[in-house]
Amino acid sequence: SERCDDWGLDTMRQIQVFEDEPARIKCPLFEHFLKFNYSTAHSAGLTLIWYWTRQDRDLEEPINFRLPENRISKEKDVLWFRPTLLNDTGNYTCMLRNTTYCSKVAFPLEVVQKDSCFNSPMKLPVHKLYIEYGIQRITCPNVDGYFPSSVKPTITWYMGCYKIQNFNNVIPEGMNLSFLIAFISNNGNYTCVVTYPENGRTFHLTRTLTVKVVGSPKNAVPPVIHSPNDHVVYEKEPGEELLIPCTVYFSFLMDSRNEVWWTIDGKKPDDIPIDVTINESISHSRTEDETRTQILSIKKVTSEDLKRSYVCHARSAKGEVAKAATVKQKVPAPRYTVELACGFGAT
């Protein structure tokens, strides 16, 4: 056959679907690779062809669209499973072509099993809720297009293994789950099960997401430098190791980049001709507030190094702060015998 633009295996789209549930999978060509949509392609006389490679096989084979009850079908640029089976797992290819044009892409589809408590190998999306912030909602994801708006599905929400009736502060409201005030105890996996009828059959869609309760923007503050501070003086003799920790607290801020850096005499450590190493560690609180520690280390400090200015800087979306460390050269203690002699001489 003639040459075809092959976009290869699109591993960015690792599609996972539950066994024995409907799945609708759009051909990724129109979403990520081509600059036109399916309608335009269809109008231009292009045909969309589907085929697949079973798991642990190399052989590409056509998809059987003649299964009982139309279990697998194609509608426009969507491949439908009503429902999936475990052995539908494999790499699926959609190819758009006519006599002069050809473009194709493959993507992996994994059909996964779940237990009675909705545990599975499925990668779960994470939804962040602000702690004690206001009424916040999560919505049952990826259910659009499965049934027409005239069909009224039943939706049941679960936390972990248990059906949510209104416990504590959480109210099921159809496709939404409302958190009146989010508390840390709301952390966990939430599952919506959508049940709808189609052609005399009943289908279930199971969608699980992880809720993580994070710091509220109303409590967010600019970075706080705990160290260096005015109470600690770094007093060293030449030849000793100088270790200065810079410890900074960052409030959780959605999509904020938290940064900590040192300057020595106003320059980045890399731009100073001394042997400096900086080690960073990061820890998080339960609400994802962050504490970053950067330890500046000079193995064998010189008297010149002890005269330099060491400043710790921190920046987040809330602002920028800086704090200088107090570094001094240790004054050698006067020798005891000399001190005594002077003392006696004075009497």
């Epitope: 248990y162 009736q165 209104n166 416990f167 504590n168 009146l180 005030i181 508390f183 105890s185």
Partner: antibody, heavy 119, light 112 residues
């Protein structure tokens, strides 16, 4: 199915002690705030106290009449809520219920256990 | 403490007729987040109380739609559109805005 089973009630002399238990099933007990509510014979409902989930700080609040005498605790691995009652008075005589929730009201209740304080 | 006051304390009703109970709080029960921290309960003879209404106006699951709650701030009402014999018992309102959580004195509904 959510179930709360209250136990531990009985007859006790004034100044005595008693420990009530509430065994919970059908929900993730460790996530839920739990309260005790009591009801004297022919009287209305009276809130006794509440314990938050440990993840929410485990804070315990008490009604003024029982503060310093009653202690609420929870054993999450055992899915059990407790009410330790010391220095009991005749006015503590009531049916004691354990309940779940708070903000949305108490949505599930135990069957109640009768505590009688009498000499 | 927030004082909850119910009226009437006794309510004789003919089956099929509507009934209404009022509950007043000593201070506003409107939470900063915009909802009212008020619940209604029915305690049938010899049973534990059951939740009817939460957040002032939301019917709890399994509660017949003849029960409805309304009001905001300090004034709340529980309405029964058509009383049935099985509704006999004591109705309580309760505030959950702050501890100590407090209940109304109760309204006894009886069939005429």
């Amino acid at each position: 199915e959510v179930q709360l089973v209250d136990s531990g009630g009985g007859l006790v002399k004034p100044g005595g002690s008693l420990r009530l238990s509430c065994a919970a099933t059908g929900f993730t007990f460790s996530n839920v705030w739990m309260s005790w509510v009591r009801q004297g014979s022919g009287k209305g409902l009276e809130w006794v106290g509440r314990i938050k989930s440990k993840t929410d700080g485990g804070t315990i609040d008490y009604a003024a009449p029982v503060k310093g005498r009653f202690t609420i605790s929870r054993d999450d691995p055992k899915n059990t809520l407790y009410l330790q009652m010391n220095s009991l008075k005749t006015e503590d005589t009531a049916v004691y219920y354990c309940t779940t929730g708070e903000l949305l009201g108490f949505d599930y209740w135990g069957q109640g256990t009768l505590v009688t304080v009498s000499s | 403490d927030i004082v909850m006051t119910q009226s009437p304390l006794s309510l004789p009703v003919t089956p099929g007729e509507p009934a209404s109970i009022s509950c007043r709080s000593g201070q506003s029960l409107l939470h900063n987040n915009g909802f009212n921290c008020l619940a209604w309960y029915l305690q049938k003879p010899g049973q534990s109380p059951q939740l009817l209404i939460y957040l002032g106006s939301n019917r709890a699951s399994g509660v017949p739609d003849r029960f409805s709650g309304s009001g905001s701030g300090t004034d709340f009402t529980l309405k029964i559109s058509r009383v049935e014999a099985e509704d006999v018992g004591v109705f309580y309102c309760m505030q959950t805005l702050q501890t100590p959580i407090t209940f109304g004195q109760g309204t006894r509904l009886e069939i005429k």
